[in-house]
Interface confidence: low
């Protein structure tokens, strides 16, 4: 929540439209990896500000007479991790008045992401040839989940799912045997998280 | 030429109230964070409140509710209303701007000195 | 009782190398920059070294920062007798700026 202080002036948002907010190469990266956060307005602008709400680390400015400021993180570390924003300005707006500020964006800077759950459903004990369904869940959108089978070198299946978490169905005559996921970010550099636990399925 | 002029320091009784401004020239007083510092007789400095750009102000625990910082950009100006005083509350108070990247304060104020006694 | 810990004193004599110390933990120091602040007796702060181990334009480059894990240091080499001063380390963590209680260096002889 981004609450101006005072004398700081945030116009209607049909005044000075909000400008976008962008991650390269991802908004998910190991340590160390060089990120370019991209703020690009609906209109040349003069300034363009990147700050991180609810925080008091000071802000970065770009003085540029276009569209677009890139904001280079280099070698980024988990502490620079968070919530980021980005503003613009004209000089012709007079002091203090900046644009809106763009949606958020979450970037995340981690060697391993938070392991995931792996549930069946209805449940783990399923009738002779019954299908069943498996859902591996992480805490993240946007993922490659893969789904693993114990004694089977290769991965199962794979999904690519824009929430947070992906189904795999498994064949009611196959389905018996033990199980764990994970998930990973879908393009280089590539973030894996920790294995799930192990989740056994037997007939009943 | 960037300077930092702090005035609004003198004599108050306990439990009085005292309002300091620090006024700014040489930049674009808006676009920065202003934060307010404080010292006591022989002691170390101590961070008192900040302004951001965007957002709510930050304060130390020790000053929350007692102490507002404010800013006025059209007057290049930063305040801090100061409530409550107690003797402890003697210091030199700076105004110091910080830096566009890496949590540092670039530029201080000379400081103007509160006194709390009866 | 300041969060980042500072020697309260450190001393040496003109030329000598002398190094200044300043703990803190994981929510600070750990994740975040620190910077170092020189106070000379009856002046204002002044800004020694920004981001660990940047120096501003105008600070001589005997003074150098250094960070590894929770703890920053601060050199002086070439000691001269005008480097007789507090200096304070700082840092912040999410919801406050955090400053070490100081050192008094002493220029001996």
């Known amino acids: 929540d981004i609450t101006p202080s005072v004398a700081i002036i945030v116009p209607p948002a049909s005044y000075h439209p909000k400008p976008w907010l962008g991650a390269q190469p991802a908004t998910v990266v190991t340590p160390g990896v060089n990120v370019t956060l991209r703020c690009r307005a609906p209109q040349p602008a003069w300034r363009f500000g990147l700050f991180k709400p609810g925080e008091i680390a000071p802000l970065l400015f770009r003085d540029v007479s276009s569209e677009l400021a890139e904001f280079f993180l280099e070698e980024v570390t988990p502490a620079q991790g968070g919530s980021y924003r980005c503003c613009y300005r004209r000089p012709d707006w007079g002091p203090g008045v900046w644009s809106q500020p763009s949606d958020v964006l979450e970037l995340l800077v981690t060697e391993e992401l938070p392991r995931p759950s792996l549930v069946a459903l209805p449940g783990p004990v399923v009738g002779p040839g019954a299908n069943v369904s498996l859902r591996c869940a992480g805490r993240l959108r946007n993922m490659s989940f893969v789904l693993y089978r114990e004694g089977v070198a290769a991965p199962l299946q794979y999904r690519h799912s824009a929430q947070p978490w992906a189904d795999f169905t498994l064949l009611g005559a196959r389905a018996p045997g033990t199980y764990s996921c994970y998930y990973h970010t879908p393009s280089a550099p590539y973030v894996l998280s920790q294995r799930s636990e192990v989740l056994v399925i037997s007939w009943e | 030429e960037v300077q930092l002029l702090e005035s609004g320091g003198g004599l108050v009784q306990p439990g009085g109230s005292l309002r300091l401004s620090c006024a700014a020239s040489g930049f674009t007083f808006s676009d920065y964070y202003w934060t307010w510092v404080r010292q006591a007789p022989g002691k170390g400095l101590e961070w008192v409140s900040g302004?951001?750009?965007?957002?709510?102000?930050n304060y130390a625990q020790n000053f929350q509710g007692r102490f507002t910082i404010s800013r006025d950009n059209s007057k290049n100006t930063l305040y801090l209303q100061m409530n409550s005083l107690r003797a402890e509350d003697t210091a030199v108070y700076y105004c110091?701007?910080?830096?566009?990247?890496?949590?540092?304060?670039?530029?201080w104020g000379q400081g103007t000195l509160v006194t709390v006694s009866s | 009782q300041s969060v980042l810990t500072q020697p309260p004193s450190a001393s040496g004599t003109p030329g000598q190398r002398v190094t200044i110390s300043c703990s803190g933990s994981?929510?600070?120091?750990?994740?975040?920059?620190v910077s170092w602040y020189q106070q000379l007796p009856g002046t204002a702060p002044k800004l020694l070294i920004y981001g660990n181990s940047n120096r501003p334009s105008g600070v001589p480059n005997r003074f150098s920062g250094s960070k590894s894990g929770t703890s920053a240091s601060l050199a002086i080499s070439g000691l001269r007798s005008e480097d007789e001063a507090d200096y304070y380390c700082q840092s912040y963590d999410s919801s406050s700026w955090l400053f070490g209680g100081g050192t008094k260096l002493t220029v001996l002889g």
């Open positions: 302004s951001p750009v965007f957002g709510a102000a």
């Open positions: 994981s929510s600070n120091i750990g994740n975040n920059y």
């Open positions: 110091a701007k910080a830096g566009f990247t890496g949590g540092h304060f670039d530029i």
